[in-house]
């Protein structure tokens, strides 16, 4: 039993860290394989998260951590039994991947103006709190060429748009997912998309 | 009422060995580190080493390195400190102490809250 | 191993008046926003030491609240609001960030 691709782990940068990797052959993660973490740190101990299967010979593992802060760094060991297939360390504040948004919600009855707001991830306490932005994706049901981004970069969780902005009569999706610059984290995932049906008035034309 | 107790001091000569012992109670012992701290007389105090809640980690001064073993019986609620090859500036007074809780991912430090009454370890010929 | 330097070693203090200790290490015991991993701890005559300060400025249980400890990175004080005769003995800062935990020499408070 070997490792094929080597544990990769990202952090949320609140209580969890997914690791994923490959091995030479199909597995059963759960029975075979340990992957045990130990924060770098005086007197702190071993604990072992129990892997899953993520495809034929994939697995992963998702670390429970009490919290992060940018100094940490945990040591990683990967054992088949008795047997260590690898040794590895891990820094989260250098690998984040933030939490998805929630709770998005498209308010369609302040004028011709749609509200676009969704939950932050993250607890006040938490420094990504305050340094997250957002991509906001809209996209036409009927229309695949009817699809657009926009940047929040501000960090209140709303967006504002014109409804004119977007075809009248038809259905639209709304999904929204955040990144933060200050750790250079990747994208999060995005959010399950809200649906809204996008009717406004036309302009009264004059002949 | 959280409590630490020690012994197994006594007078032993240069070369010689001693166990002290230091029995927890009123706390869940297994899920703390826990520390020994000495005090030569008329001197400041000395760390001598800690050990995990598991006991899988052990950390020694450079002075008793090699010559003290710590260890700890979760089953019996106690922590000892072997001393071998004694020598005459091991003399002192040795306190245990509760350190902090190691069962977490990240170990949560309350300080040196409960230390013992101490007993003293005299290295004489 | 860091060195934990205290001063002034002794400190005569008239009852009712403040007192202040200081202690400095060789390297910063902050590891993260608000945890500085330094104590103080008090010695009284023939006892055994008892924790006053964790974490740089957390008063431990039971601790009156005349007792306070401030500063970060390197540089720490202890302060005393109102020194009251019980307060004499030795106080010692010390170090939990690494191993070798260090203690400073130790402050001797005295009452005039």
């Known amino acids: 039993m070997k490792v094929l691709q080597e544990p990769t782990c990202v952090s949320d940068y609140m209580s969890i860290s997914t690791c994923e990797w490959k091995m030479n052959g199909p597995t059963n993660c759960s029975t075979e394989l340990r992957l045990l973490y130990q924060l770098v740190f005086l007197l702190s101990e071993a604990h072992t998260c129990i892997p899953e299967n993520n495809g034929g010979a994939g697995c992963v593992c998702h670390l429970l951590m009490d919290d992060v802060v940018s100094a940490d760094n945990y040591t990683l060991d990967l054992w088949a039994g008795q047997q260590l297939l690898w040794k590895g360390s891990f820094k989260p504040s250098e690998h984040v991947k933030p939490r998805a948004p929630g709770n998005l919600t498209v308010h369609t009855n302040v004028s011709d103006t749609l509200l676009l707001t969704w939950s932050n991830p993250y607890p006040p306490d938490n420094y990504l709190y305050n340094h997250l932005t957002y991509a906001v994706n809209i996209w036409s049901e009927n229309d695949p060429a009817d699809f657009r981004i926009y940047n929040v970069t501000y960090l209140e969780p709303s967006l504002r748009i014109a409804a004119s902005t977007l075809k009248s009569g038809i259905s639209y999706r709304a999904r929204v997912r955040a990144w933060a610059q200050c750790y250079n984290t990747t994208w999060s995932e995005w959010s399950p998309s809200t649906k809204w049906h996008n009717s406004y008035r036309e302009p009264f034309e004059q002949h | 009422e959280v409590q630490l107790v020690e012994s197994g001091g006594g007078l032993e000569q240069p070369g010689g060995s001693l166990r002290l012992s230091c029995a927890g109670s009123?706390?869940?012992?297994?899920?703390?580190?826990m520390t020994w701290v000495r005090q030569a007389p008329g001197k400041g105090l000395e760390w001598v080493s800690s050990?995990?809640?598991?006991?899988?980690?052990?950390y020694y001064a450079d002075s008793v390195k090699g010559r003290f073993t710590i260890s700890r019986d979760n089953s019996k609620n106690t922590l000892y400190l072997q001393m071998n090859s004694l020598r005459a500036e091991d003399t002192a007074v040795y306190y245990c102490?509760?350190?902090?809780?190691?069962?977490?991912?990240?170990?949560?430090?309350?300080?040196?809250?409960?230390w013992g009454q101490g007993t003293t370890v005299t290295v004489s010929s | 191993d860091i060195v934990m330097t205290q001063s002034p070693l002794s400190l005569p203090v008239t009852p009712g008046e403040p007192a202040s200790i200081s202690c400095t290490s060789s390297?910063?015991?902050?590891?993260?926003?608000?945890?500085?991993?330094v104590d103080w701890y008090l010695q009284k005559s023939g006892q055994s030491p008892q924790l006053l300060i964790y974490l740089g400025n957390k008063r431990a249980s039971g601790v009156p609240d005349r007792f306070s400890g401030s500063g970060s990175g390197t540089d720490f004080t202890l302060k005393i609001s109102r020194v009251e005769a019980e307060d004499v003995g030795f106080y010692y800062c010390m170090q939990s960030l690494t191993s070798p935990y260090t203690f400073g020499q130790g402050t001797k408070l005295e009452i005039k």
């Open positions: 009123g706390f869940t012992f297994r899920d703390f580190a």
């Open positions: 050990i995990s809640g598991s006991g899988d980690n052990t």
């Open positions: 102490a509760k350190d902090r809780l190691s069962k977490t991912i990240r170990p949560r430090y309350y300080g040196l809250d409960v």
């Open positions: 390297q910063s015991l902050l590891y993260s926003i608000g945890k500085n991993y």
